[in-house]
């Protein structure tokens, strides 16, 4: 494949992840998302700070964003709903769960992911697979085919030093590395997926991209598992 | 459809600054990063920087840092360039990129007394 | 900072014959951009990521290379293709182009 990054990575396998989802505001890419289960795709609140006069619709099925795909097929949004205490100006409780306007219909390139309800930080140095539609290098390029890349998870204590995020870690996120490679914008929303499982979602603050000193912030779904199950029941 | 309109040509006297507008249609310029490249009366292109409108943060050439200035009000969706203690060295036109990829139509600055 | 070479500076070519400029820059880079520019408009981009065609390039342009060393092919010559084209690397700041390489009609 060419060499598209998410920033230092590649484009993935051709629907490969079944449960990647692009948040598309008035038909153009804005987050990444992951269907979590047959009708709801968990998103970042801040996705939709600019979206009060659009159309908020979800893509499901998608390698490409442009070109046809038999799995394709792009969903109204019924409901939003972004976690209560999220707030413009911080990163904290940055999820969002979309309801879509019926269920999805499922098949091997569109699948609901499991998601960690076991509130547990995942061990440092796990590699976590992170993937979207967000820009792939420096200049702002963004790709029209999915890209993707294995982040090794970061301590909290070594994220929150002063040099790093200065403490603005808690126990609900959880960090991974970013020394060249590493989710940027447009990846906002978008799966942390470690051992098949989705332990994180890339929270979309405007963070410097591909500095190791500025590591990615993921929100922790464990931590929000009470709060998922009762927007999902 | 991506579109960045800059602003009109602009006569300016030795040592006075000049601020060029880039507004941007059919995109909302949070999502990417604005640079700025200047080229001289026949000659190539030169890259000035960039902005992330998100935060703000600025990356410049060398060269160019004290010269210019650049900014983004994302709430209008419009990068700025501000070129400062003008000589007719700073006579060039100046285009706006998103990404690199799309460029707009350039602003002519030339400088003279 | 990284220095970009192109070269030949002025070349021209016949309409279906192949042409190949070359960009080489001092130390490595990782990825390389190129544009074209038409008297009188802005540059447009034709090549990103050393060999990935942009959007809306026709499929005569193709680039290659690594290391210290790459190339724009245009592999049948149109009158539409007189232009000067520039590379661009992407590796190191501060980002820099090649001084172009001015291709005209014969």
């Known amino acids: 494949p060419p060499r598209g990054r998410i920033l230092g990575g590649r484009e993935a396998e051709a629907h490969a992840r079944p449960y990647m989802a692009s948040v598309q505001l008035n038909g153009a890419h804005l987050c990444g998302g992951v269907l979590v289960a047959e009708q709801w795709v968990l998103s970042a609140a801040h996705c939709l700070e600019d979206a009060a006069d659009g159309k908020v619709q979800v893509l499901l099925g998608a390698h490409s964003l442009s070109q046809p795909e038999p799995s394709k097929r792009l969903y109204d949004v019924l409901r939003a709903v972004p976690h209560p205490d999220s707030q413009p100006d911080t990163i904290d409780h940055d999820l969002l769960l979309l309801q879509l306007s019926e269920k999805a219909t499922l098949g091997p390139a569109v699948r609901p992911l499991p998601w960690q309800r076991v509130d547990r930080d995942v061990a440092p140095g796990t590699l976590c697979d992170v993937a979207g539609w967000g820009i792939v290098n420096h200049a702002g390029r963004r790709p029209d085919s999915l890209q993707h890349v294995l982040l090794p998870v970061l301590d909290r204590a070594t994220c929150n030093r002063r040099t790093h995020h200065d403490g603005a870690i808690t126990e609900r996120l959880m960090c991974a590395e970013s020394n060249r490679r590493d989710s940027c914008k447009g990846d906002s929303g978008g799966p942390l997926v470690c051992g098949g499982v989705l332990e994180g979602v890339v929270t979309s603050g405007s963070r410097v991209c591909g500095n190791r000193k500025k590591p990615g912030i993921y929100t922790r779904v464990a931590s929000y598992a009470a709060w998922i199950d009762s927007v999902l029941a | 459809e991506v579109q960045l309109q800059q602003s009109g040509a602009e006569l300016v006297k030795p040592g006075a600054s000049v601020r060029l507008s880039c507004t941007a249609s059919?995109?909302?310029?949070?999502?990417?990063?604005i640079h700025w490249v200047s080229q001289r009366p026949e000659q190539g292109l030169e890259w000035i920087g960039k902005?992330?409108?998100?935060?703000?943060?600025?990356k410049y050439d060398p060269k160019f840092q004290g010269k210019a200035t650049i900014t983004a009000d994302t709430s209008s969706n419009t990068a700025y360039l501000q070129l400062s203690s003008l000589t007719s060295e700073d006579t060039a036109v100046y285009y706006c990129?998103?990404?690199?990829?799309?460029w707009g139509q350039g602003t002519s600055v030339t400088v003279s007394s | 900072q990284s220095v970009l070479t192109q070269s030949p500076a002025i070349m021209s070519a016949s309409p279906g014959e192949k042409v190949t400029m070359t960009c080489s820059a001092n130390?490595?880079?990782?990825?390389m951009y190129w544009f074209q520019q038409r008297p009188g408009s802005s540059p447009r981009l034709l090549i990103y990521?050393?060999?990935n065609l942009a959007s809306g390039v026709p499929v005569r342009f193709s680039g290659s290379g690594s290391g210290t060393s790459y190339s724009l092919t245009i592999s049948r010559m149109e009158a539409e293709d007189a232009a000067t084209y520039y590379c661009?690397?992407?590796?190191?700041?501060?980002?820099?182009f090649g001084g172009g390489t001015k291709l005209e009609i014969k």
């Open positions: 990129v998103n990404a690199m990829e799309y």
């Open positions: 059919g995109f909302n310029i949070k999502h990417t990063y």
């Open positions: 902005i992330d409108p998100a935060n703000g943060n600025t």
């Open positions: 130390s490595s880079v990782s990825d």
């Open positions: 990521d050393t060999s």
């Open positions: 661009q690397q992407w590796s190191t700041y501060p980002w820099t």
